[in-house]
């Protein structure tokens, strides 16, 4: 269901903790006194808080912190991920037996940890499968016409267009639009073969597409995915968009009308993965050697020999299946109705691993952890934890899009973060993590109190690492959440700075996974400490643990990007100060809610509760009003795609400097106004009630 | 033709092991599970584990966990179960079968004729 | 684990006559999304090893006789001989596919009178 993005950041390296930045969001991180724990009962106790008022809170934040520490220690991670990559449950393609056999383990699993409530939500959806009779097929036709078979794959990529086409072949590198557009050669009317990394494969494809290439071939090069078979098989799907792409915009619950349509990013060319040995195979027939800069193994070659063609035949079919999401949940003792998501995907094509079997596995361990400490330990979360194994992942977050499409009205009033335990084990080296800004702080204070697993220090090792955060991308599952839904979510992993090079191949094994990763238990452990604690933040505190605060600085860089086109805007007859003005609201009211929050009486829930729903509009304000979420699903101004983005918008005006005939002003027009007014409706969000908000503007 | 070849009688000592074998024809190796099925003397099927040999994945019986050991040589078409610790409990005869590979659960359409183990001193 | 029950253990009956056979288990082998049953039936001839004849409850592999049927849906299916053959004599043993661990009941000892 739709449009597409990829994950990862730095913090790396060694040394002991340091001292975080403030922020909006981060006033009430330490946990509650005994007092505020008591707020809401039948007669709160009221204290002004004394002297020892932040030690006390601490050391009930060190007390939870402990207690799940205590249970890390004691859980046998490596078990469930080696149960969960048994033939029992692998592989498991979305909405086969195996994936269903998996969903009911997991579901029982959670009415054995005894959460509060368990249930699954249905769907029927339609992906693409390999077709079971005819198979696909690359080849390539000599000038007199014989045929040299080159492979039928194992692998496929879902949403191809399934056709037949012949022509020329090209290499173009990662396929890349700043590859495409380096190219010396021209790839109109050519098939293209690319590497796979880098990019995901429906942004290859719609690449490719708008070069007007006329089909793809991806496979991985020795150098990005040093594995030693060659014929390994590669899966992965080419819909630049998340959910099934035949109900975009909406949920595919069985009792909805489905009217006839299709995600616009579904490809209109046909996209096949091919072996090393087959991509090698055809580097045979090929001349030109591939420039120094694109660090490739020497095999690789530029363009296909004179009077020769390749031939592509994808005959992959559509397929209804039934999904099933698991959810279940521990209610909050204080706003059950507000809640963190805790997700994973568990389908896999392939035995999946590192793909789906970790993620399910912290899943399942979290579970039970967070269940113990309420029913045993007496923690009591303000708020409540959900849950959430999603099926069809593999095919663009369909499991969780779905759910997310099928309740966009209400969600993001009732569903705050959401945290994605998907590929969260990789590697060792690093400590990588994308997210909302709006969870910056959250992340600061966690990576200063987990250590890594194996050199022992804390994570938290460069002040400077908010800068260096890689966007959220189309293939992770937080990206729906964050740009469709306008929840702030987040995705991280201990990883290594090259790809995993088992994802989506038949080699993604528990074996294989526990001999990169001799440490699999420690990291695994490490991981779910992270996730734990943000789980308690997120829940335990008083203020919802967003810091608002931190979009000050998007905007602020947002706008020195515009700077740079001042004469570019003036010569338009247009201003920046209606711009500078909504951000300066935006300012305001991050400083005003702060002051309100300082001066909250913090044992009043009904003045707390107040502030926080002003917290939680924040993240979904940051959706463009002015787009259709069926039309353009990720409307979120920063993270999204599409016109609306700030970034096309200065994409626009780039335009306008290298090209004043492409340059589209009225188009120019409309995003300056559009921005304009959807900033100036989160800061009018941030700032409560109609009253208080100045209209001078 | 489609075949498993397993070889006739293995005579083990007490708490050793065995290795035993059964070489696949007439297939593609990689597309179907290996399944071994232990019967004893008079006695009923009982399902030991099975092996994918695309992805070297495997699954046991509980009872089995510990006791046997799958793995495959790919190269050869041929795939292995290691009995260890034997006990006169484990004279039986060992049959390997197959049963497809994918994502649902299969039967099994072809059987080797079975290895008889003895154990004893 | 998914209990297989067989009766009766054995029967001997005459060449040419019908002949039943039952097999329970401890839950349902109906798989809801595709409707089918996972259930097999085995010959074990004297000496021989398993021979599949009838797998997904009812339908028989190719080049077994069609005087062999099996029935039943959910927990409780039929392996029916229609004319008995003297060839026949074997134990029938059924297995459920639908998890793992894979079980099998304890079989149908079918003698010749």
């Known amino acids: 269901h739709h449009h597409h993005h990829h994950h990862h950041h730095h913090s790396g390296g060694g040394g002991s903790g340091g001292g975080g930045s403030g922020g909006g969001g981060s006033k009430g991180v330490e946990p509650k006194t005994e007092s505020e724990r008591l707020a809401g009962t039948e007669s709160p106790v009221r204290e002004e808080p004394g002297e020892d008022f932040p030690a006390a809170r601490r050391l009930y934040w060190d007390d939870l912190k402990r207690k799940l520490s205590e249970k890390l220690d004691s859980t046998d991670f490596t078990g469930t991920i080696k149960l969960l990559n048994e033939n029992s449950y692998v592989p498991r393609e979305a909405g086969s037996q195996k994936d269903e056999n998996l969903a009911l383990y997991v579901e029982n699993q959670f009415r054995e940890f005894k959460l509060s409530k368990v249930w699954r939500d249905q769907h029927f959806v339609k992906i693409q499968v390999k077709d079971s009779i005819g198979q696909n097929m690359v080849t390539i036709v000599q000038s007199n016409g014989n045929l040299d078979p080159v492979e039928s794959p194992e692998g496929y990529v879902a949403f191809s267009k399934p056709t037949e086409v012949s022509g020329k072949l090209v290499h173009a590198n990662f396929g890349t639009k700043k590859d495409f557009e380096e190219l010396s050669y021209s790839v109109n009317g050519s098939l293209v073969i690319v590497r796979a990394g880098e990019i995901t494969f429906a942004e290859k494809v719609a690449n490719a597409q708008s070069f007007n290439a006329i089909g793809v071939l991806i496979y991985m090069d020795k150098n990005k995915f040093p594995v030693v078979e060659a014929d390994l098989a590669l899966f992965g799907h080419a819909h630049l968009g998340t959910g099934d792409p035949y109900t975009p915009g909406f949920p595919s619950f069985n009792h909805t009308q489905f009217p006839p349509s299709q995600s616009s990013g579904l490809p209109n060319i046909p996209v096949q993965t091919i072996s090393r040995a087959a991509a090698e195979k055809l580097f045979g027939k090929m001349e030109g050697s591939c420039p120094a800069r694109w660090n490739i193994d020497s095999s690789c070659k530029l363009e296909l020999s004179q009077n020769q063609n390749v031939k592509l035949i994808v005959k992959n079919v559509l397929k209804e299946i039934k999904i099933l999401n698991i959810f279940g949940v521990i209610k909050g003792f204080v706003e059950p109705d507000h809640y963190v998501v805790v997700g994973a995907q568990r389908d896999a094509w392939g035995p999946g691993a590192a793909k789906s079997g970790v993620g399910t596995a912290l899943l399942l361990k979290l579970a039970q952890m967070f269940s113990d400490m309420v029913l045993k330990d007496g923690f009591q979360p303000s708020r409540s934890i959900i849950f959430a194994s999603w099926s069809a992942g593999d095919f663009g977050s369909v499991g969780a899009t779905e759910w997310l499409e099928g309740y966009l009205s209400s969600l993001h009033l009732k569903a705050f973060t959401y945290i994605n335990l998907d590929k969260a084990v990789l590697g060792t080296s690093n400590f990588k993590v994308s997210a909302s800004p709006l969870l910056y702080t959250l992340i600061e204070k966690t990576m200063q109190n987990v250590k890594h697993p194996v050199t022992g220090q804390f994570l938290y090792q460069d002040s400077n690492w908010a800068s260096k955060v890689e966007k959220l991308t189309l293939d992770n599952a937080a990206f729906p959440f964050l740009a469709y839904s306008g929840i702030p979510a987040v995705s991280f992993c201990f990883c290594e700075d090259t790809d995993y090079p088992y994802l989506g191949t038949t080699m993604d094994t528990y074996k294989e996974l526990i001999e990169r990763i001799p440490e699999l238990n420690k990291v695994a452990r490490a991981a779910a400490e992270v996730a734990g604690q943000f789980v308690i933040k997120l829940t335990h505190d008083v203020e919802l643990n967003l810091d608002y605060e931190m979009y000050n600085s998007k905007l602020l860089s947002f706008m020195k990007d515009l700077n740079q086109f001042k004469t570019d805007i003036r010569d338009m007859g247009l201003s920046l100060q209606w711009l500078y003005s909504a951000r300066g609201d935006y300012f305001r009211a991050t400083s005003r809610l702060t002051t309100d929050f300082h001066n909250a009486e913090k044992t009043n829930r009904f003045v707390m509760r107040e502030i926080n729903d002003r917290i939680m509009k924040v993240e979904y304000h940051f959706l463009s009003p002015y787009v259709s979420p069926r039309e353009s699903p990720f409307r979120h101004i920063f993270w999204g795609s599409g016109s609306h983005t700030l970034s096309a918008l200065v994409e626009n005006l780039k335009l306008r400097q290298k090209n004043i005939t492409a340059f589209n002003e009225t188009l120019f027009r409309n995003q300056l106004a559009l921005a304009t007014w959807t900033i100036q409706g989160v800061a009018n969000a941030l700032s409560g009630d109609i009253w208080n908000i100045d209209n001078e503007f | 033709e489609v075949q498993l070849q397993q070889f006739g009688a293995e005579l083990v000592k007490p708490g050793t092991s065995v290795k035993i074998s059964c070489k696949a024809s007439?297939?593609?190796?990689?597309?179907?599970?290996m399944d071994w099925v232990k019967q004893g003397h008079g006695k009923g099927l009982e399902w030991i584990g099975d092996i994918n040999p695309n992805y070297d994945t495997t699954s046991y019986s509980q009872k089995f966990k510990g006791k046997a050991t799958l793995t495959v040589d790919k190269s050869s078409s041929t795939a292995y179960m290691e009995l260890r610790s034997l006990t006169s409990e484990d004279t039986a005869v060992y049959y390997c079968?197959?049963?497809?590979?994918?994502?649902?659960?299969?039967?099994?359409?072809?059987w080797g004729a079975g290895t008889t183990v003895t154990v004893s001193s | 684990d998914i209990v297989m029950s067989q009766s009766p253990s054995s029967l001997a009956v005459s060449v040419g006559e019908k002949v039943t056979m039952s097999c329970k288990s401890s839950?349902?082998?109906?798989?809801?999304?595709?409707?089918?049953?996972?259930l097999a039936w085995y010959r074990q001839k004297p000496g021989q090893s398993p021979k599949l004849l009838i797998y997904w409850a009812s339908t028989r592999e190719s080049g077994v006789p069609d005087r062999f049927t099996g029935s039943g849906s959910g927990t409780d299916f039929t392996l029916t001989i229609s004319s008995v053959k003297a060839e026949d004599l074997a134990v029938y043993s059924c297995?459920?596919?639908?998890?793992?661990?894979?079980?099998f009941g304890g079989g149908t000892k079918l003698e010749i009178k």
């Open positions: 007439g297939y593609t190796f990689t597309d179907y599970n």
């Open positions: 297995q459920q596919y639908y998890n793992y661990p894979y079980t």
């Open positions: 079968a197959r049963s497809e590979a994918g994502n649902y659960y299969w039967y099994f359409d072809v």
């Open positions: 839950q349902s082998l109906l798989y809801s999304s595709n409707r089918k049953n996972y």
